[in-house]
């Protein structure tokens, strides 16, 4: 057992059929000796008296909010949390296996930039009863400071009979050099839970690693004369590193048809412009990506031909 | 060697093209290792990542771009102790810091040379003979040696009595192809920085 | 803050019925169990009925068989079905609402009340 927060406790248990369980002790937390009862979870039922309590917590039903009392009056409270260990694995219930980039991927993190400031979200098909604590760290030895916000509510999708609904956090790190080579990485560590159910996940990465940058901006078509070309220009988002001399970026402009079965023209380029063959009703995407380390390409910002 | 200032990209700085050949060498041969020892722990996940250069140079510092000095947490160590003049830059252009910054980018490259050619004597004594240093990464690493043209003392390539354990060798290749992939991208970056400046 | 808003209170005749509601809004977080409770003029307040978060509910001797307590989580609603109304269930009825929200920790929230009086 061990605590999660001021009066708020994680009862860690092998979860399998009549497993023994774990035995708790409970002490009120009052100078008071005598005339002390134990309830859970608001019920009138009592379950003990004195200023310790001894149970077996073996299933949820456990599990809850534990009050001593004194004469009608609240002394502490207790709440004990159940976290299932089946088959030498941690339970992972809460959370949806992404399966991106690999199985087991629970947490998925992304940075727009190299300025130490990255965003993860984590779906889950529950809808209430749910809470989440997010930490972060360069390092997990000699641990060195990230910063994150609250955990929100960021969209919620309809898949098939099911409702799945995803979660966010944004964190920065507190003292980042966007020029640095990174040697520690980044841990994330996100607490979850469900009713009385603890669970634990984590992520580990180099901002390096995680670098998406958002697409190009004010793209822009220049027809050329007595040609079917045109001039594409755009420019870097305005939220990548600077300065873009040293933070560059590489380019990737595609010509796509209406029809998806269309043949597509691809180009790659440096430079923050390109000439391509416009065809009728075709529309030209351009995305980018870290020049020097290739981490995840940008989503596509598109413009039509005509 | 010291090209005129009017001549066009990429002329101007020959060194850009040398680093971007450095980029596609290292990165080729990492992705040549990750291949051949996969079922060595030589994933970035899986290795621990060290720096031999550390505390010896400082060319993340000795290069920062003018626009990062302004950033506290960019500026831990701004002091090294080279302060040579190097010839890829036309010489009306180099400044005191570009100076050592590419007189710190030599000598990375002269430490992990040492290492690379340290590590592949020892693999090519391997049984297995199943991973060697790729020849155009060694090569390519001279080649941007050159065209910084630093003067420095020859640094004697390590060599050991005892029987080499090749196990722990292909690890630290993997260590050491990881580090310098990453100080290639750095080493890239700056290129590109100074070409504009 | 978790806020609750009590409502379905009224003046109904002995062997009458009334539901209660009570619903919560705010960042509610986990919810550990939820409570109804009452408290007649020049008494103290006294548990009802209550419900913890596996659903299991529990009752005061005096209502058990005419009280019933149910959740709908969807709606972050709680009920309090009250049938075969006496005289002696008069009182200002509050919800009660404990909670845990891991980035502040446990919280016990009450409603305003509603009052609920049974008179012929």
């Known amino acids: 057992i061990w605590e999660l927060k001021k009066d708020v406790y994680v009862v860690e248990l092998d979860w399998y059929p009549d497993a023994p369980g774990e035995m708790v002790v409970l002490t009120c937390d009052t100078p008071e000796e005598d005339g002390i009862t134990w309830t859970l979870d608001q019920s009138s039922e009592v379950l003990g008296s004195g200023k310790t309590l001894t149970i077996q917590v073996k299933e949820f039903g456990d599990a809850g909010q534990y009050t001593c009392h004194k004469g009608g009056e609240v002394l502490s409270h207790s709440l004990l949390l159940l976290h299932k260990k089946e088959d030498g694995i941690w339970s992972t219930d809460i959370l949806k296996d992404q399966k991106e980039p690999k199985n087991k991927t629970f947490l998925r993190c992304e940075a727009k930039n190299y300025s130490g400031r990255f965003t993860c979200w984590w779906l889950t098909t529950i809808s209430t009863d749910l809470t989440f604590s997010v930490k972060s760290s360069r390092g997990s030895s000699d641990p060195q400071g990230v910063t994150c916000g609250a955990a929100t509510l960021s969209a919620e999708r309809v898949r098939g009979d099911n409702k799945e609904y995803e979660y966010s956090v944004e964190c920065q790190e507190d003292s980042a050099c966007p020029a640095a080579e990174e040697s520690l990485p980044i841990e994330v560590m996100v607490d979850a839970v469900h009713k009385l159910k603890y669970e634990n996940y984590t992520s580990s990465f180099f901002i390096r690693d995680i670098i998406k940058p958002d697409p190009p901006k004010n793209l822009q078509l220049k027809p050329l004369k007595n040609s079917r070309q045109v001039e594409v220009s755009w420019e870097y988002p305005d939220t990548w590193s600077t300065p873009h001399s040293y933070f560059s970026l590489t380019f990737c402009v595609q010509v796509q048809g209406k029809s998806k079965r269309e043949k597509k023209d691809r180009v790659f380029t440096d430079k923050t412009s390109a000439t391509v063959i416009c065809r009728k009703n075709a529309s030209i995407s351009v995305r980018a990506q870290d020049r020097y380390y290739s981490s995840s390409w940008s989503e596509w910002a598109s413009v039509p031909c005509s | 060697r010291n090209l005129p200032v009017a001549t066009p990209d990429p002329g101007m700085f020959p060194c850009l093209h040398h680093s971007q050949n450095l980029l596609r060498a290292v990165s080729n041969m990492l992705q040549k290792a990750r291949q051949t020892l996969e079922f060595y722990p030589c994933t970035s996940e899986e290795i621990d990542h060290e720096d031999i250069t550390k505390d010896k140079t400082s060319t993340v510092e000795a290069c920062l771009p003018l626009e990062l000095t302004k950033n506290e947490s960019c500026l831990n160590s701004r002091e090294t102790s080279f302060i040579t003049n190097g010839s890829c830059l036309a010489s009306r252009k180099t400044s005191f810091m570009m100076a050592l910054c590419l007189s710190s980018i030599y000598e990375d490259l002269k430490m992990y040379q040492v290492e690379f050619k340290t590590m592949n004597a020892k693999l090519l004594m391997d049984p297995k003979r199943q991973i060697f240093l790729d020849q155009n990464m060694l090569a390519v690493i001279d080649e941007l040696m050159q065209a910084l043209n630093f003067n420095s003392e020859t640094v004697p390539q390590k060599s050991s009595l005892e029987e080499p354990d090749f196990y722990k060798t292909k690890i630290k290749l993997c260590i050491l192809l990881h580090a310098f992939r990453i100080r290639a991208v750095t080493i890239d970056r700056v290129m590109s920085y100074l070409n504009a400046s | 803050e978790v806020q609750l808003v009590e409502s379905g209170g009224g003046l109904v005749q002995p062997g009458g019925s009334l539901r209660l509601s009570c619903v919560a809004s705010?960042?509610?977080?986990?919810?550990?169990?939820t409570g109804w409770y009452r408290q007649a003029p020049g008494k103290q307040r006294d548990l009802v009925a209550s419900i913890n978060s596996g659903g299991r509910p529990n009752y005061q001797d005096s209502v058990k068989g005419r009280f019933t307590i149910s959740r709908d989580s969807a709606k972050n609603t709680v009920y309090l079905q009250m049938n075969s109304l006496k005289p002696e269930d008069t009182a200002v009825y509050y919800c009660n609402l404990r909670g845990l929200v891991l980035s502040t920790g446990l919280y016990e929230s009450w409603g305003q009340g509603t009052q609920v009086t049974v008179s012929s």
């Open positions: 705010g960042d509610i977080g986990s919810m550990t169990s």
